[in-house]
């Protein structure tokens, strides 16, 4: 008998870009007249359903209707496969596909990580106490959370306060503070991504005397 | 053998539309996406829009919204690209052309002759 | 859109010398396709997914890259290679290519 096979590691997508997943029989078997399932999760949650020499759309849960393209130029050879378009952080998780003849059905099961490379973080200055720079430094649009990091001259790591919040996509924002002096020299706030290994950097230098000291009066009328 | 037949040149007046046709050959349509691709003349590729011909669903590039229909007819194994309200910029030859699929990504792979679109007063 | 920018624009090569073409994208993307373009034909497919040498090309041509920065290498130019070379990425909609570089041989 024949057995199904899918992607043999998680297969990586870019929120926003397209997915490709391909199963096929082994030994090479003709799938026209079999049925053919690609679920999310549990078999009842139908992303994509092949059936009766045709695509059966209305069996399809609503956040994937529009979205998915079953390609069938190899499916008398046993290959099937399925593009999924536009994808978001809330198509993360684990996918199968399922084919089945009238007798007997295999499936096989895979993960679908999604990521999101986030801006280069901009760093700005937000207060200025007793020659103390705060600096905050802002990026937006990664998944899942990255890795965010004050750096001192020497690469080496700063403690800093986080803030993260969700944008309505799902993807996170990040805000990291930190407190230096005037004479702190060059700092980097870095963003590393977790799954990509891939890291986004900005660099302030902060020099001896970064604001010059000034004589305020208050100017009257 | 795989192959994509575009029909032939044409020859317009502005402000005139142009259906031109992709007719496949070995290869069954409905079974991907087929995708249409503009080059002006000495300049570069830049995608029009795909129709899946299974079921009419089409997507265009922001540029050709309201300048292209991509259509297909399944029975003939066709796919239709017509550009309306014709201006000297439409003059480009136009590719028809198929995803292929590798098992894990996609990339244009089946390609038509191109056909020559001038426009013309 | 993602906005792919090829450089340079034209590059001249010798037979049998070593060139790179680069291909940089405005966003991330997945995957960089390359196609070559000869005078009045339709463009052929050269390189798929970055890296992969398509059906029939010879392996003087191979492809590198990741993230924003794609670049394709010949590794002894051939008279034969003279042609428009095109980045195109096919991860997110609207699909896109790059302006292309043409290739002549001295």
């Known amino acids: 008998q024949w057995q199904v096979f899918g992607p043999d590691k998680p297969v990586q997508a870019l929120v926003g870009e397209d997915a490709a997943f391909s199963c096929f029989l082994s030994p090479k078997t003709n799938a026209e007249a079999m049925e053919v399932r690609f679920f999310r999760g549990q078999f009842s949650s139908v992303v994509h359903l092949y059936r009766d020499g045709k695509d059966q759309p209305f069996m399809q849960m609503p956040q994937y209707q529009g979205r998915t393209k079953l390609v069938k130029d190899s499916i008398a050879e046993g290959r099937i496969s399925l593009r999924l378009e536009n994808i978001t952080v809330l198509d993360a998780g684990l996918y199968g596909c399922r084919i089945s003849s009238q007798s007997y059905y295999q499936k096989a099961i895979w993960e679908l990580q999604v990521s999101a490379l986030g801006s280069v973080p901009l760093i700005s200055i937000t207060g200025y106490v007793d020659r103390d720079i705060q600096l905050l430094c802002q990026s937006s649009g990664w998944f899942p959370r990255p890795t965010a990091k004050w750096k001192g001259p020497q690469g080496q790591d700063l403690s800093t306060d986080s803030r993260t919040n969700r944008d309505m996509h799902g993807l996170f924002d990040v805000e990291i503070s930190l407190t230096v002096q005037e004479n702190a020299g060059s700092i980097s706030c870095s963003m590393r991504h977790a799954h990509l290994s891939r890291e986004v950097e900005s660099r302030v230098q902060i020099g001896d005397t970064f604001f010059e000291p000034i004589s305020w009066h208050l100017a009257t009328k | 053998e795989v192959q994509l037949q575009q029909s032939g040149a044409e020859f317009v007046r502005p402000g005139a539309s142009v259906k031109m046709s992709c007719t496949g050959s070995?290869?069954?349509?409905?079974?991907?996406?087929m995708h249409w691709v503009k080059q002006r003349p000495e300049q570069g590729l830049e995608w029009i829009g795909r129709?899946?011909?299974?079921?009419?669903?089409?997507k265009y590039g922001p540029k050709f919204q309201d300048k292209a229909t991509i259509t297909a007819d399944t029975s003939s194994n066709t796919a239709y690209l017509q550009l309306s309200s014709l201006t000297a910029e439409d003059t480009a030859v136009y590719y028809c052309?198929?995803?292929?699929?590798?098992?894990?990504?996609?990339?244009?792979?089946?390609w038509g002759q191109g056909t020559t679109l001038t426009v013309s007063s | 859109q993602i906005v792919l920018t090829q450089s340079p624009a034209i590059m001249s090569a010798s037979l049998g010398e070593e060139i790179t073409l680069t291909c940089s994208a405005s966003?991330?993307?997945?995957?960089m396709h390359w196609y070559q373009q000869k005078s009045g034909t339709s463009p052929k497919l050269l390189i798929y997914?970055?890296?992969n040498l398509a059906s029939g090309v010879p392996s003087r041509f191979s492809g590198s890259g990741s993230g924003t920065f794609y670049s394709l290498t010949i590794s002894s130019v051939e008279a034969e290679d003279a042609a428009d070379y095109y980045c195109h990425q096919w991860s997110r909609y609207p699909y896109t290519f790059g302006g292309g570089t043409k290739l002549e041989i001295k």
């Open positions: 997914s970055t890296s």
């Open positions: 129709i899946d011909p299974a079921n009419g669903n089409t």
């Open positions: 070995g290869l069954n349509i409905e079974d991907d996406y």
């Open positions: 966003s991330s993307v997945s995957y």
């Open positions: 052309t198929r995803n292929y699929y590798d098992g894990s990504l996609y990339y244009f792979d089946y």
